[in-house]
């Protein structure tokens, strides 16, 4: 039961996380104009990964896409790439994890196959979360660097007669959404990996039982069945003897050298 709950919760947390990563990637407010001593501004600038926007006091908002690819800073391209990789990995992870869910029956898919799929999706979620966190952190670092550079050059002009106020940018809402979403995806991935341990068929110590068949005797010794390590393996490990009827979730598992950590 705990395995199913852990797997289900991991899936839901990852789903929320990936939705957040997608939302953050699409959001326009990655960086917003720093209002320092002026909380009300007539012209408010904010920028995303794909376009920059200006909201006037009049209520009019204008957004312009970055129609150039080569003209964009390498760091911005890197952040875009990290976020997209995170989304793609997360989406594939979600697809894999749906089929891996213990509560969903697909043909005669075994626990070993589901365990492998759970582990795969968990790893994908972890990498997806790390990509998002890395992307957002790179962008945040870029903002901090630019912020202090523009603070140093805050006012420029000749003899102080004509002032050019440089627009400074600070952290936008998308950064916080991205960090939280990346964290959730990471947590969801870890939960999936933990659930995988409980799903994997283990080497079980059964008492040796002798069956007397007509003509010859066959003794089944403990340790005869190993959990398959093959990715997506469909090997069926049939138990010869079970010391009592148990529901699927109640079957006890013991750690073995084949556990995925």
């Amino acid at each position: 039961m705990a395995v199913t709950a852990c797997q289900g919760l991991g899936f839901v947390v990852s789903l929320i996380g990936i939705a957040g990563i997608i939302a953050a990637t699409c959001m326009d407010q990655w960086s917003t104009q720093d209002l320092y001593n002026n909380p009300v501004t007539a012209v408010f600038n904010y920028q995303g990964l794909w376009r920059s926007c200006v909201r006037e006091s009049s209520g009019f908002t204008e957004c312009r896409g970055y129609f150039t690819l080569l003209g964009l800073p390498a760091m911005l391209q890197a952040v875009r790439a990290l976020m997209i990789v995170g989304i793609v990995l997360g989406a594939i992870g979600l697809l894999v994890s749906i089929f891996a869910l213990k509560c969903i029956r697909i043909g005669s898919m075994e626990d070993s196959a589901k365990a492998n799929m759970t582990l795969t999706s968990g790893i994908m979620f972890i990498v997806s979360g790390l990509c998002a966190i890395a992307g957002v952190s790179v962008f945040a670092n870029m903002l901090v660097t630019n912020f202090w550079m523009s603070t140093a050059n805050m006012y420029t002009g000749m003899g102080g007669m004509v002032q050019t106020v440089q627009t400074r940018y600070t952290f936008g809402a998308a950064l916080f959404v991205g960090w939280v979403a990346g964290g959730l995806t990471l947590i969801g991935g870890v939960m999936m990996c933990i659930a995988c341990r409980g799903l994997a068929p283990e080497e079980t110590n059964y008492k040796a039982v002798s069956y007397h068949a007509s003509g010859h005797s066959v003794a089944y010794k403990p340790g005869g069945f190993k959990a398959s390590t093959g990715f997506g393996s469909n090997t069926k490990n049939k138990k010869i003897y079970d010391g009592g009827a148990r529901t699927e979730d109640e079957v006890q598992s013991y750690p073995s050298k084949h556990d995925y950590v």
Epitope: Q33, R64, V162, V165
Partner: antibody
């Protein structure tokens, strides 16, 4: 077409509070725009007083902030200006206006002349 | 506050001639976010409220004759009337639309020579 009309007393004594109302017709005051007050002393230039949004959020000219209050009544489609402790320097034509693209003012009231005199 | 300085204070131009009014701001009115200059021009005739002519320094308001044009960037701006008509006699104001408080120039009185 949005139309604005100012109303209020034409003559007021020094130290009193000036109260003006701007009635909006041909459009809703709740349309999302900011509604402004601008004044023009006789023979002089224009001075921005402040604005109000239909939600009640305001922004005032720092030079007048301590004396100005702008309020809105969405049910009557009106917004009002109150200027306390008036002096002869507050004698002007008071305009209400609606902002638009480029933070410009394409819509103005005809203006109401307020004279501060004892 | 941004100080707007207009020149000249008054201008006399013959009918059909070009009229040029200048406006200088104490701070740049250029917004890098949308590459626009937040300067507005108004025309005011006696006994009337100001009439919007140009916003974003060079965008003509609908209904404004094309003889009116705006130019400039940063801190220096110009309003040009390519061929002066009798009805253009008025006072012209520039406005800082970039930051609060909005400020206006002192005005330029345009007359016919």
């Amino acid at each position: 077409q949005v139309q604005l009309q100012e109303s209020g007393p034409g003559l007021i004594k020094p130290s009193q509070t000036l109260s003006l109302t701007c009635t909006v017709s041909g459009g809703s005051i709740s349309s999302g725009y900011n509604w402004h007050w601008i004044r023009q002393p006789p023979g002089k230039g224009l001075e921005w007083i402040g604005y109000i949004h239909y939600t009640g959020s305001t922004n005032y000219n720092p030079a007048l902030r301590s004396r100005v209050t702008i309020s809105v009544d969405t049910s009557k489609n009106q917004f009002s200006l109150k200027l306390s402790s008036v002096t002869a320097a507050d004698t002007a034509i008071y305009y209400c206006a609606r902002i638009y693209n480029g933070n410009s003012f394409p819509y103005w009231g005809q203006g109401t002349t307020v004279t501060v005199s004892s | 506050d941004i100080v707007m300085t207009q020149s000249p204070d008054s201008l006399a131009v013959s009918l059909g001639e070009r009229a040029t009014i200048n406006c200088k701001s104490s701070q740049s009115l250029f917004n890098s976010g949308n590459q626009k200059n937040y300067l507005t021009w108004y025309q005011q005739k006696p006994g009337q409220p100001p009439k919007l002519l140009i916003y974003w320094a060079s965008t003509r308001e609908s209904g404004v004759p094309d003889r009116f044009s705006g130019s400039g960037s940063g801190t220096d701006f110009t309003l040009t009337i390519s061929s002066l008509q009798a009805e253009d006699v008025a006072v012209y104001y520039c406005q800082n639309a970039y930051s609060f408080p909005y400020t206006f120039g002192g005005g330029t009185k345009l007359e016919i020579k």
